[in-house]
Amino acid sequence: QPSVSPGEPSPPSIHPAKSELIVRVGNEIRLLCIDPGFVKWTFEILDETNENKQNEWITEKAEATNTGKYTCTNKHGLSSSIYVFVRDPAKLFLVDRSLYGKEDNDTLVRCPLTDPEVTSYSLKGCQGKPLPKDLRFVPDPKAGITIKSVKRAYHRLCLHCSADQEGKSVLSDKFILKVRPAFKAVPVVSVSKASYLLREGEEFTVTCTIKDVSSSVYSTWKRENSQTKLQEKYNSWHHGDFNYERQATLTISSARVNDSGVFMCYANNTFGSANVTTTLEVVDKGFINIFPMINTTVFVNDGENVDLIVEYEAFPKPEHQQWIYMNRTFTDKWEDYPKSENESNIRYVSELHLTRLKGTEGGTYTFLVSNSDVNASIAFNVYVNTKPEILTYDRLVNGMLQCVAAGFPEPTIDWYFCPGTEQRCSASVLPVDVQTLNASGPPFGKLVVQSSIDSSAFKHNGTVECKAYNDVGKTSAYFNFAFKGNNKEQIHPHTLFTPRSHHHHHH
């Protein structure tokens, strides 16, 4: 019994003066609390607590369930205790079948003994199954058996308390351990689509998937910069004991333009939080925006290839696409495809492949596209660069020499005089008149240039060269002169070409 120095309040004394007492079932329990300031006796075992205001606690016929701790308390709040075992061969264990374990913590299997003198007090698996190899436990006859550091793997483990009584193994009623998992990571959240584009009045529905070790994970859809509670519907599944999945579906049945914004799916557990967002854009009607991938004015050399490429955004999806030239629709030579295979893709590519273009194939090429809401088009002006071609090379009645050349870009005509039989004509002759003949004619075709010089300027035998050139190449035509007396006579007009020139003859 406790002892204290005189003058200080002391704890009560209990008779019998023992810390433990063993009573046979059916016998009397008689406990006396000696204290001038006696207040009460309390009895505790498992789920039961009882009080008695009499200083003598008497149980005439003790039962196994009277096993437990008897505590006497005085008016100073000081107490003393005695533990009573009521030995009952028919009831070796008192049990409270509720058994919860928190992962990584210890838990108590509450199966105190009614007889402290039994041996091999331990845990056993149900139906003779072995306990997990790593399960460690510590027995205490008055409290039960503590399982150390509970693991997730012990969830739903069926066990018995066990002890040897007079050489025989006795089992308690079964316990089923329910393990509550520790959150060791944030929830895993994902969203059905990262962005949505809708027209007014269409339904917006987005699903967030939340995965965690238990259903106690918290989740919600939130609108960014708004406190309004959103309407959600849930579906959930357990894929095994510690693999929980929830689908939270947010729906706006008739979306409006002002519903546009960022929506966040937020989830948290005791470890931390995670979130994922989706963007909603609501437009009042559909649209098509076309972006040329090359300049809309295209210059291409005669005989070469060119690809006219556009990218375009279309919502809703495009229904009709076509390429047109001179009021004729291309049936082939073009392809149209989505920019990505992504479900939310609204960007597309259209390519028209023009091959071995001729000078006559310049002009306006138009791409047209439409969806259920709008039409859109874009035009490309294609110019075919051609080397000059000398169309005519004549001596006119009025003594003029005339050279007419066609090409694109507009050719430049230069004149040269070569005295005698020299091959190289270097002395340039200024033209009297230069005209662009079809400047007001149809666009995109070859440009025709006419240049004239006065032949009376030539006093000696020789050759006149008309040289037409542009960025693509050059062509020359020659006119030979011989003098007979005072008369100047055209002997042999003809064209000669450099290897890069196109053949053209006049006689």
Epitope: E44, S98, K102, N105, I176, K178
Partner: antibody, heavy 116, light 107 residues
């Protein structure tokens, strides 16, 4: 013998909150779980959530998450259930019950009426 | 969440009758099933836990059986005090869910 005694009936306005208490006696409070189960008039039973006081954390049914808070005060052996943003369909008898899985002891119930 | 379906929703019987109520789970719940009795204006009372274990203090005329998805509560000989609503409840996974109830009435 274990007893669970709940606080009295409440009448609340929509949008407000209610906090119901459940005092346990005759048993060890902290080592047991305590759940809250509600029953709307003429309807069945619906588990809202539960707490194991010694673990300190609560489990909630998704339907009530964000709106219900379950707490426990070990010093007074009392559990509490607070339900916020009340609506008319929250009118029900709210029971506390011992356990997180099956429920061996029940409180007498607390009628919460939500009415404007 | 796991759905629990009870049948019948109500039944009429006489004192002394053998009464059987069934409960079906939407997925395997092993033996994590309890049965409760509720009388008007009272809290439910646990009768059976772990599908077939009789709760302390409950008369032996009540028994439970089943495993997996199909479960049965049997009252071997109906007594006047047994007229009540009976609920099944699964607790294999949280959230725990209840059946819609079976009302046992006097014929």
């Amino acid at each position: 013998q274990v007893q669970l005694v709940q606080s009295g009936a409440e009448v609340k306005k929509p949008g407000s909150s209610v906090k119901v208490s459940c005092k346990a006696s005759g048993g060890t409070f902290s080592s047991h779980a305590l759940s809250w189960v509600r029953q709307a008039p003429g309807q069945g039973l619906e588990w809202m959530g539960g707490i194991i006081p010694s673990f300190g954390t609560a489990d909630y049914a998704q339907k009530f998450q964000g709106r219900v808070t379950i707490t426990a005060d070990e010093s007074t052996s009392t559990a509490y259930m607070e339900l916020s943003s009340l609506r008319s369909e929250d009118t029900a008898v709210y029971y506390c019950a011992r356990g997180l899985y099956d429920f061996d002891y029940w409180g007498q119930g607390t009628l919460v009426t939500v009415s404007s | 969440d796991i759905q629990m379906t009870q049948s019948p929703s109500s039944l009429s019987a006489s004192v002394g009758d053998r009464v059987t109520i069934t409960c079906r789970a939407s997925q395997d719940i092993s033996q994590d099933l309890a049965w409760y009795q509720q009388k008007p204006g009272k809290a439910p009372k646990l009768l059976i836990y772990d599908a077939s274990s009789l709760q302390s203090g409950v008369p032996s005329r009540f028994s439970g059986s089943g495993s997996g998805t199909d479960f049965t509560l049997t009252i071997s000989s109906l007594q006047p005090e047994d007229f009540a609503v009976y609920y099944c409840q699964q607790y294999y996974y949280l959230p725990s869910t209840f059946g819609q109830g079976t009302k046992v009435e006097i014929k």
